[in-house]
């Protein structure tokens, strides 16, 4: 029951956490125009990773596209890249986590290959909520950098006269949803790799083994089996788990140590 | 078409306040912002600031931030701007624009302008 | 405050001439987002409020001749009427449309020779 909570669970945090990775990657607020100690203009500029735009007191907005390719900063592209490989390992990871799960049957599927298909999930939730927190912090970065040498720059006098005021820009609303998403991703992919840990079958093959004692016969069983005397009509050997008991004769296939927490 | 109607000429004794109005027609009035502008006789134009009727957010040019002060009624499409302590200096015609949409933060309607004499 | 400061004051001319106006800004309106220049030109007749030409530095409002021209960028701006004629003989305004608060010059009149 509780790998299943903590599976879905897992599942859960993880397609919020990658919803919010591709809402990040989509907004176009990466970086807002500092209004902080500077002088206030009638229109308001921010930047995303496929465009700018720039907003006027109106209301009229305007966005243009970051039509070239080679003429971007390299930061840039590889914030990109690493934005859309988290979304891709992430999307990946849902696909593979939604036929892991144990609610889910899908036709005779071992327990062995679901969790090896919840620990591959786990792992690429992880690695993608790694690349959304690294892109972003690269962003965050860089606008840090470029915050600090154009405050040491605000104003270029041209010729002591005729100032030209340099905008500057803050983190936007896109680097906060993108480092919390991502950090979404990591907790659920951790999660999924717990789950995995609970669905992994156990190699131990559980056969009674006998000790004859001076007294009355009493059979010891490893493994979490209720030792039974030989006095009472109770003869088979029960396991007890949470959905009621089922003999040793019955089980078919060796069940997961952890099948029946 | 688009309009601004402003209210008819005042005359106020210095101290004394004034409530000016400037109605909107021809177009959604809580979507564009309305301007007041300030011009001497003989003189150039001063802008005082703006009213944005859908968030009744206000913007002011600090001289003029404890002279002015603008409303707005989305009910009856009209915008107000109040002037108090009159001086002599406040003896002016009174102007109401809208701001245009996509247009570089520009106006392009105004209103024909009141006319604010203080005299004694 | 921005300071914009038109030159000349004021300009004799004759029609069919063509007339350059000026007008500079004590800091750049230059828009690096969307690489505009905030600057707006307005016609203003006597007992007339102003009337809306120029925005953007050199973007024509609907409705206004095409003699009526504007260029420039950063803190210097011209407007142009290519050929003047009898009813463009007004006070000529620039205006700062970028920095609160938004600050215009002292106008350009133009007058008949």
């Known amino acids: 029951m509780a790998v299943t909570a903590c599976q879905g669970l897992g599942f859960v945090v993880s397609l919020i956490g990658i919803a919010g990775i591709i809402a990040a990657t989509c907004m176009d607020q990466w970086s807002t125009q500092d209004l902080y100690n500077n002088p206030v203009t009638a229109v308001f500029n921010y930047q995303g990773l496929w465009r700018s735009c720039v907003r006027e007191s109106s209301g009229f907005t305007e966005c243009r596209g970051y039509f070239t390719l080679l003429g971007l900063p390299a930061m840039l592209q590889a914030v990109r890249a690493l934005m859309i490989v988290g979304i891709v390992l992430g999307a990946i990871g849902l696909l593979v986590s939604i036929f892991a799960l144990k609610c889910i049957r899908i036709g005779s599927m071992e327990d062995s290959a679901k969790a090896n298909m919840t620990l591959t999930s786990g792992i690429m939730f992880i690695v993608s909520g790694l690349c959304a927190i690294a892109g972003v912090s690269v962003f965050a970065n860089m606008l840090v950098t470029n915050f600090w040498m154009s405050t040491a720059n605000m104003y270029t006098g041209m010729g002591g006269m005729v100032q030209t005021v340099q905008t500057r820009y803050t983190f936007g609303a896109a680097l906060f949803v993108g480092w919390v998403a991502g950090g979404l991703t990591l907790i659920g992919g951790v999660m999924m790799c717990i789950a995995c840990r609970g669905l992994a079958p156990e190699e131990t093959n559980y056969k009674a083994v006998s000790y004859h004692a001076s007294g009355h016969s009493v059979a010891y069983k490893p493994g979490g089996f209720k030792a039974s005397t030989g006095f009472g009509s109770n003869t088979k050997n029960k396991k007890i788990y949470d959905g009621g008991a089922r003999t040793e004769d019955e089980v078919q296939s060796y069940p997961s140590k952890h099948d029946y927490v | 078409q688009v309009q601004l109607q402003q209210s008819g000429a005042e005359l106020a004794r210095p101290g004394a306040s004034v409530k000016m109005s400037c109605k909107a027609s021809?177009?959604?009035?809580?979507?564009?912002?309305i301007h007041w502008l300030k011009q001497g006789p003989g003189q150039g134009l001063e802008w005082i600031g703006y009213?944005?009727?859908?968030?009744?957010?206000?913007n002011y040019n600090q001289k003029f931030k404890y002279k002015a002060t603008l409303t707005a009624d989305k009910s009856s499409s009209t915008a107000y701007i109040q002037l108090s302590s009159l001086t002599s200096d406040d003896s002016a015609v009174y102007y109401c624009?809208?701001?245009?949409?996509?247009?570089?933060?520009?106006?392009?309607?105004w209103g024909q302008g009141t006319s604010v004499t203080v005299s004694s | 405050d921005i300071v914009m400061t038109q030159s000349p004051s004021s300009q004799t001319v004759t029609a069919g001439e063509k007339v350059t106006l000026s007008c500079r800004s004590s800091?750049?309106?230059?828009?690096?987002?969307?690489?505009?220049?905030?600057l707006t030109w307005y016609q203003q007749k006597p007992g007339q409020p102003p009337k809306l030409l120029i925005y953007?530095?050199?973007t024509r409002e609907s409705g206004v001749p095409d003699r009526f021209t504007g260029s420039g960028s950063g803190t210097y701006f011209t407007f142009t009427i290519s050929s003047v004629q009898a009813e463009d003989l007004a006070v000529y305004y620039c205006?700062?449309?970028?920095?609160?608060?938004?600050?215009f010059g002292a106008g350009t009149k133009l007058e008949l020779k």
């Open positions: 205006q700062n449309a970028y920095f609160y608060p938004f600050t």
């Open positions: 953007w530095a050199s």
């Open positions: 624009a809208r701001e245009g949409y996509g247009r570089g933060n520009a106006m392009d309607y």
């Open positions: 021809g177009y959604t009035f809580p979507t564009y912002s």
């Open positions: 800091q750049s309106l230059l828009n690096g987002g969307n690489q505009k220049n905030y």
């Open positions: 009213i944005n009727p859908s968030t009744i957010y206000t």
